[in-house]
């Protein structure tokens, strides 16, 4: 198990990228003058107190941000949110965090994000460029799940 | 408002069995953690163990393994701990508490009343 | 095992300054121990006072505070009120197990 959060970048399907918009993270299209967020990620240390089979547990941190995100209910409904958190006070806590920690699971080069809070709620993209990342039930409609991670060393 | 409530105090014979219940009320059971102390008469805390309700995943500390069982109903929000082989040192009020994240840290937010077990031939 | 100690015993006046202390036999104290803090009063429900060594619990009034002081966790209670009476009660991880202390029973006299 990593103790140092490993350096990632994240596209999805159609090649857009996350950007740090007004502290909201959007998904755009990579292009020159776009310059996409570097994620940090790195495996929850109570793997044995989490679902088996489900994923990797991780904490997704805006490398070099102090960011990191998270899933809250607004009204009945979860959310996706950027809270200005540690993402090594996150990994050292004696118990899982649950509201930061997603579920990681990888098919062939695909990766999605499943929340730990709120199984079944996954980190996805509007088909639409431009937009926020949100979390979605609607797997492989409307949203794009499914992201790509390439490490960065 | 939150709660935590308690079965009834219990009188064992030793070798038995007790159950002691802890209903939540006022919050998801599934969204935090349920933890069990115990305070033995004039003794301090002592920890029993943790279950995470949502999925059911226990913790216990090595000294309670085999002696303490943590389950939760999650339809009746209901914590519970059983304990085997009951013996006389096994006197002594049990505890639940919910262990919460909020902001920056855990903390013990909220106890039962705790449940005295009494072990007596 | 690791063995938590703290104060049996400790008297504060009211209005003045204590601060009770939390040892662990395995050596000193860190932030990795991620102590917490417990209140009981006479014929009340615990309360949680102090987690992650330092951070108050909601609702918590500012005279209470968490550190680490010489190798040891600290609670400091600073202008103790008389309803501030009561056992406290420290407890420190240790990987994936927590202990407790014995207790400190506060008089404010």
């Known amino acids: 198990k990593s103790e140092m959060p490993q350096p990632v970048s994240i596209q999805d399907i159609n090649h857009r990228v996350w950007v740090l918009q007004d502290q909201i993270l959007i998904a755009v299209p990579r292009k020159d003058r776009v310059s996409p967020v570097t994620i940090s990620l790195i495996s929850c240390r109570h793997v044995e107190t989490l679902e088996k089979d489900r994923g990797n547990p991780i904490y997704l941190g805006l490398n070099g941000l102090n960011l990191c995100l998270m899933c809250a209910k607004a009204g009945d409904q979860p959310t996706l949110q950027l809270k200005e958190k540690d993402i090594m006070d996150l990994y050292n806590q004696p118990e899982p965090v649950k509201s930061f920690l997603f579920y990681h699971s990888q098919s062939g080069r695909n990766s999605t994000f499943e929340s730990v809070a709120f199984p079944g709620w996954f980190i996805a993209v509007s088909s639409e460029g431009g937009c926020p990342l949100i979390l979605t039930q609607e797997l492989g409609k409307a949203n794009t799940t499914d992201f790509g991670l390439t490490m960065l060393f | 408002q939150v709660q935590l409530v308690q079965s009834g105090a219990e009188v064992k014979k030793p070798g038995a069995s007790v159950k002691v219940s802890c209903k939540a009320s006022?919050?998801?059971?599934?969204?935090?953690?349920i933890y069990w102390v115990r305070q033995a008469p004039g003794q301090g805390l002592e920890w029993i163990g943790r279950?995470?309700?949502?999925?059911?995943?226990?913790r216990y500390d090595p000294k309670f393994q085999g002696k303490a069982t943590l389950t939760t109903d999650t339809s009746t929000s209901t914590a519970y701990l059983e304990l085997s082989s009951l013996r006389s040192e096994d006197t002594a009020v049990y505890y639940c508490?919910?262990?919460?994240?909020?902001?920056?840290?855990?903390?013990?937010?909220?106890w039962g009343q705790g449940t005295l077990v009494t072990v007596s031939s | 095992q690791a063995v938590v100690t703290q104060e049996p015993s400790l008297t504060v006046s009211p209005g003045g300054t204590v601060t009770l202390t939390c040892r662990s036999s395995?050596?000193?104290?860190?932030?990795?121990?991620?102590a917490n803090w417990v209140q009981e009063k006479p014929g009340q429900l615990f309360t949680g006072l102090i987690g992650?060594?330092?951070d108050r619990a909601p609702g918590v009034p500012a005279r209470f505070s968490g550190s680490l002081l010489g190798g040891k966790a600290a609670l400091t209670l600073s202008g103790a009120q008389p309803e501030d009476e009561a056992d406290y009660f420290c407890?420190?991880?240790?990987?994936?197990?927590?202990?407790f202390g014995g207790g400190t029973k506060l008089t404010v006299l």
């Open positions: 508490a919910r262990y919460d994240y909020s902001g920056s840290s855990f903390y013990f937010d909220y």
């Open positions: 006022g919050f998801n059971i599934k969204d935090t953690y």
């Open positions: 279950i995470d309700p949502a999925i059911g995943t226990t």
């Open positions: 395995t050596g000193a104290v860190t932030t990795s121990n991620y």
């Open positions: 992650g060594t330092n």
């Open positions: 407890a420190l991880w240790y990987s994936n197990h927590l202990v």
